[in-house]
C-alpha cells in the first residue's frame, strides 16, 4: 500500500489569473480621497451612498445627505456650497470629451431639507461651480456664462456671444481641454468670490474634423469638432474678469496679454488667483519654448486689471520645450507676491525654486540628480512636495516636507519609511492650512489610504486598506515584478519586468513589450496593478517588459528633451536596445517577441515592428498616431515644431508609419482603432491600412464602431479577448 500523496495545500489551492478576472475587474482596488470642507472635516460617500461628514477632531460622523435624497434625482455627484447652506446634485451625466460632460443640476437646501424651487437651472449644463465663499453659483449653458447670487435667484447672464463650435465662454474647446488646461472648465473664482475670471475661445477659423457616428438610425450622424492639427489655425483666446458683486456695473474687463507674447500666435496656459485683487496668468508662445507668467492687479479707480512689465516672469528652454508635459503652475506664499515653482535648474533637473522678484534671482529650494514633481501645499512654515529622490528610483513618489519658517530650511521625507515594501508611490490630499492630510499609496503592494496629522505627520487612521482585495488575492498566483535599469551608451533605461509565477531563468519565455513612450511620460512606476499583462504572465507564461527610453520624464532634461523635434526615432531605438539586452539575459525565446501599445504607444509599436531589425515576430497598435500632421497642434508642435519647409516639415514626413509600409511584410501586425476617436482620429489607421494595401502587405485589423480613444464598455472585453488570441497565435500557445 502506498501512503496518500501529500500535496502542498497552499500551491494546490492557488490558481492563475484568468482573462475573465481582468475583464470583470475582480482585482480592482479602492482609494480614499477625502472631500475636504475645512481644516478638520471631510465629506465622503459611504458604501450605502449617504454623503457623510467626518470630523477628525471629534471622531464623529454625520449624514448630511441621505441616499434617498440622492436617489430622488438619480444623483451621481454632489457639491457642497462653502457656507454649507446648499448642495448641488448632479445627474444625467453625459460624457463629451476626456474631461467634459454635461449634466442636470438640482439645488438642495440643507437648512430645510427641500429642493430649491423657482428659477431652476436650465439643462443640460456644461459646467457649474460654487463661489469659494458663500453660495453664489457660476455656470455655463450653451457656451455662455451665468451667475446667481443665491441658488433661488434669477440668473445674471455674463456673456452673450457663445455659439456651438464657434465661441466658448468659461469652458475650453477641444484642444484646450485635451492639451493645455486638462479640465472641463475655463473659469476661476477669486479666493473670496468677489471676481470671476474666464476664458473666451474663438474657434471660428479652426478647421473642422468630421467623422461618422453610425448609431442606430438609417443615416449616420456627422460629428464636427473644431480641431487644429499641426500647423493649422489655432483658437484665439481672451481672458476676462467680472465683478460678481456688481456684475452689470462695468461688465467683464479683459486682461491684457504681455507684449512679447501678443506679437505672434500664443496660448493661455493657466490662471491662478493670488488674492481677490491680484491674479496670475500664464501665457505661452505657439512655439512652446517661451512662457510668460504675468501678475496683474485690480485698479479700483479705473475698474481695470493692470499687468506691469515688472511683474512679468519669463521661462525659456534652450534645449527643448518649456516645462515638462505642461508648464508648471506657481504656488504663492502668504506675502501674495513671491511664489514657488518647479522648473529646470542649471543641471537640467526639474526642481522647486522660490521667486521673490525676478526669475534670474530665484532661490533653488530642492536640488539633485532627481526631480521634484508636484508642490502640494505651502503653509506659513512648511512646503509639501513629491519627488523621486528616495533611493534613486525615478518611478517612485514620496512626499516631503520642507520647513520654510526656519533657516536653513530642513527637509523631511514624510513617507519614505512608513510601509517601505508596500508603499513606494504616494500622492497626498491636504485639508485647509494642511491641518490634516490623506496619503494615498498606489503600490507596489496593495494600495492603502491613510489619514495623518499635518503638524506631527502621525498616522491617525486607515481610510482604506483594500482588505477584500488582499483576501481575494490570497489564492492567486500573481506574477513577479522587478524594476531595474540598463546602462547603455550613457543612457539609463529603466525597465519593469513582469515574470510568470514559476519563473525559471534556465527556461525560454515569449516576451511582450508594452510601450507608451510619449514625451514626458513614465511607464516604469512602482505601482500595484492586476491587469491584462498580469494575466498574460500569470496564465499564459509570457514575460512582459516596459521600458522608459529617451523622451520619458523625471530623469532630467537630457533624457526628456532628447526627442525634441525628432519624435519617432529614439523612443523606438531604445525599445529595440532594451529587447536586445533582454535577449542577452538568456531566458527570452528570441523567436517569440512581440510589442504592443496604445495611442503614442501604438505609434512606437508600429515603428518598432517596421524597424527592419527582425526582432519582433508580431505586434499590435491600438489607436495609433500614424503621422504627426494628423495630430493636435498644441501637443504636436510642442515637441516637433511646425510642419513647414523652413521649420520641421522634413521630419514630419520622415516619421510617419506609412513611410515604412514595406517593412511590415515580415511581421504579423494587428491594427485596431475606434471609428469615433475624437483624439487620435480614425484617419491615422485608415492611412496605415491604405499604405499597407498599396504595398500589398498582409495585416490584421479590427475597428470598433462608434468608439472613442478609450474603447470602453463591451468593446474593452472584445478588444482584450481579440488581442489575447492574436498573441497566443503568434507565440504558438494553445487556447
Amino acid at each position: 500500500l502506498r501512503p496518500p500523496r501529500v500535496h502542498n495545500s497552499e500551491e494546490n489551492t492557488m490558481r492563475a489569473l484568468t482573462l475573465k478576472d481582468i475583464l470583470n475587474g475582480t482585482f480592482s482596488y479602492k482609494t480614499f480621497f477625502p472631500n475636504w470642507i475645512s481644516g478638520q472635516e471631510y465629506l465622503h460617500q459611504s458604501a450605502d451612498n449617504n454623503i457623510v461628514l467626518y470630523n477628525i477632531e471629534t471622531g464623529q460622523s454625520y449624514t448630511i445627505l441621505s441616499n434617498r435624497t440622492m436617489k430622488s434625482v438619480n444623483a451621481s455627484n454632489y457639491g457642497l456650497s462653502p457656507d454649507r447652506q446648499f448642495v448641488y446634485l448632479e445627474s444625467d451625466y453625459s460624457k463629451l470629451w476626456r474631461y467634459s460632460y454635461t449634466a442636470t443640476y438640482y439645488i438642495y437646501d440643507l437648512s430645510n431639507g427641500e429642493f430649491v424651487r423657482g428659477n431652476e437651472l436650465p439643462r443640460p449644463i456644461q459646467y457649474l461651480c460654487w463661489s469659494p465663499v458663500g453660495s453664489k453659483l457660476a455656470y455655463v449653458y450653451q457656451n455662455n456664462i451665468y451667475l446667481k447670487q443665491r441658488p433661488g435667484d434669477p440668473p445674471f447672464q455674463i456673456t452673450f456671444n457663445g455659439r456651438e463650435n464657434k465661441i466658448f465662454n468659461g469652458i475650453p474647446d477641444w484642444v484646450y481641454e485635451e492639451e493645455m488646461l486638462a479640465t472641463k472648465y475655463a473659469l476661476w473664482w477669486s479666493p473670496n468670490g468677489k471676481f470671476l475670471a474666464y476664458a473666451e475661445f474663438n474657434d471660428t477659423d479652426i478647421p473642422v474634423i468630421a467623422y461618422s457616428y453610425y448609431g442606430d438610425e438609417q443615416y449616420p450622424r456627422t460629428i464636427n469638432i473644431p480641431y487644429p492639427k499641426a500647423g493649422a489655425k489655432n483658437p484665439f483666446v481672451r481672458i476676462f474678469i467680472i465683478d460678481t458683486t456688481y456684475p452689470a456695473y462695468v461688465g467683464p474687463q479683459e486682461v491684457p496679454v504681455p507684449a512679447m507674447i501678443a506679437s505672434s500666435d500664443y496660448y493661455f496656459s493657466w490662471l491662478t488667483w493670488v488674492t481677490d485683487e491680484r491674479v496670475c496668468l500664464q501665457w505661452l508662445k505657439r512655439v512652446q519654448n517661451v512662457s510668460v507668467l504675468s501678475i496683474c492687479d485690480f485698479r479700483e479707480d479705473w475698474q481695470t486689471w493692470d499687468c506691469p512689465k515688472t511683474q512679468e516672469h519669463i521661462e525659456e528652454s534652450r534645449t527643448g520645450w518649456a516645462g515638462g508635459f505642461f508648464v508648471s503652475t506657481p504656488v504663492f506664499s502668504y506675502d501674495a507676491i513671491s511664489y514657488y515653482k518647479i522648473f529646470s535648474d542649471k543641471d537640467g533637473y526639474k526642481h522647486i525654486h522660490y521667486i521673490k522678484d525676478t526669475v534670474e534671482n530665484a532661490i533653488q529650494i530642492t536640488s539633485g540628480k532627481w526631480e521634484a514633481i508636484n508642490i502640494f501645499r505651502v503653509t506659513q512654515d512648511s512646503l509639501f512636495y513629491s519627488s523621486n529622490e528616495f533611493e534613486d528610483y525615478p518611478g517612485r513618489r514620496n512626499i516631503y516636507r520642507i520647513s520654510i519658517g526656519s533657516y536653513p530650511p530642513s527637509k523631511k521625507c514624510v513617507t519614505c519609511h512608513l510601509r517601505k515594501e508596500r508603499c513606494q508611490y504616494y500622492t497626498a490630499s491636504f485639508s485647509d492650512y494642511a491641518k490634516y492630510y490623506a496619503l494615498v499609496c498606489y503600490g507596489p503592494g496593495i494600495p492603502i489610504s491613510t489619514l495623518h496629522d499635518g503638524r506631527t505627520d502621525q498616522e491617525i487612521k486607515i481610510l482604506e486598506e483594500n482588505k477584500e482585495l488582499e483576501n481575494a488575492l490570497k489564492n492567486i498566483q500573481l506574477p513577479k515584478e522587478e524594476i531595474k535599469k540598463l546602462e547603455v551608451d550613457e543612457i539609463t533605461l529603466w525597465y519593469k519586468m513582469i515574470l510568470p509565477p514559476q519563473f525559471d531563468r534556465s527556461k525560454k519565455y515569449p516576451l511582450l513589450i508594452q510601450v507608451y513612450g510619449g514625451p514626458c511620460s513614465q511607464s516604469v512606476r512602482s505601482v500595484f496593478a492586476v491587469n491584462w499583462i498580469s494575466y498574460l504572465a500569470s496564465k499564459e507564461g509570457m514575460v512582459i517588459a516596459l521600458v522608459d527610453g529617451r523622451g520619458t520624464a523625471f530623469q532630467g532634461d537630457k533624457l526628456l528633451y532628447a526627442v525634441y523635434r525628432k519624435l519617432g526615432v529614439y523612443e523606438v531605438e531604445d525599445q529595440i536596445t532594451a529587447v536586445r539586452k533582454f535577449i542577452e539575459m538568456g531566458f527570452i525565446d528570441e523567436k517569440r517577441i512581440a510589442i504592443w501599445g496604445w495611442s503614442y504607444g501604438g505609434y512606437v509599436s508600429s515603428l518598432a515592428l517596421a524597424s527592419g531589425t527582425g526582432l519582433f515576430k508580431c505586434g499590435i497598435a491600438v489607436a495609433p498616431v500614424s503621422s504627426w500632421e494628423y495630430y493636435a497642434s498644441v501637443y504636436t508642435e510642442r515637441f516637433m515644431g511646425l510642419p513647414t519647409k523652413d521649420d520641421n516639415l522634413e521630419h514630419y514626413k520622415n516619421s510617419t508609419v506609412m513611410a515604412r509600409a514595406e517593412y511590415f511584410r515580415n511581421v504579423d501586425y494587428l491594427l485596431i482603432h475606434g471609428t469615433a476617436d475624437d483624439n487620435v482620429h480614425f484617419q491615422n489607421s485608415a492611412q496605415i491600412a491604405k499604405a499597407l494595401v498599396n504595398a500589398q502587405v498582409d495585416f490584421q485589423a479590427m475597428w470598433y464602431s462608434d468608439q472613442n480613444h478609450g474603447l470602453s464598455g463591451l468593446s474593452t472585453n472584445h478588444l482584450y479577448t481579440h488581442m489575447t488570441h492574436f498573441l497566443k497565435q503568434c507565440f504558438s500557445l494553445s487556447d
Epitope: S38, E57, T63, I64, R84
Partner: antibody, heavy 119, light 111 residues
Amino acid sequence: EVLLQQSGPELVKPGASVKIACKASGYTLTDYNMDWVRQSHGKSLEWIGDIYPNTGGTIYNQKFKGKATLTIDKSSSTAYMDLRSLTSEDTAVYYCTRFRGIHYAMDYWGQGTSVTVSS
Amino acid sequence: DIVLTQSPVSLAVSLGQRATISCRASESVDNYGLSFINWFQQKPGQPPKLLIYGTSNRGSGVPARFSGSGSGTDFSLNIHPMEEDDTAMYFCQQSNEVPYTFGGGTNLEIK
C-alpha cells in the same frame, strides 16, 4: 412634522440607573445624529453626547463618560440614553435633540424627561 | 472647555424696540471662515427652540426680526422690533469644539 417623543418622568433612588427613550418620527432616524442635553433646575444647559445612528458611533462630554451611554434601535426609530450611578446632582430635565451635522445645530428637541434622584 | 459668557443676564425692552444679547467665548470659535455659534429661545415649561445657527442663519420658521452676527469670540443676537411673544430665556451655544457648551442664558422681558 418632525417629532421627538420622550419617555415619561422618572423618580429613582441614588445609585440606581435609568433608561430614557426618545422616539423619532416625521423624518428618517438614520439621517441625523441624536444629541442629548440636560438642564438642571434654574441652571443652564449641558451637552451630554452625540450618537451617529448608522454605526452607533458615539462621542461624549468627558464629564458624562461612565455616567451616560447612548444607543439606537433603528428598527423602532428610537434613541436611548442610559444613566447610571445616579446622585442628587443628576436631578434634571434631559432632552434628546436632532443634530444637523452639517451646521452642528440641534434643530429639533424632545419635550424633555424629568429625572428626580431622591432617597 | 470653551466658556460662553452671556450679557446681560436679564434685559427689559419696550415693544417695537431693539433687544441685543451678547455672547463672548473664552477662545475663538471660528472654523475656516464659519463660526458654529447657535442661539436658542426657551419659554417656561418648553424645550429650547433653535433660532439662529452658524452665527447668522435663521432656523426654519424663525421670523426675520431675529438676526445674529459676530466672529471670533464676540457674537450677538438682535431682536427688532421686539414683540410680546419674544419674552423668554435666550441661550448661545458653541459647536466648534467638543464638549459643546452653552452660555448661562439671558432673560428677556417686556419693559
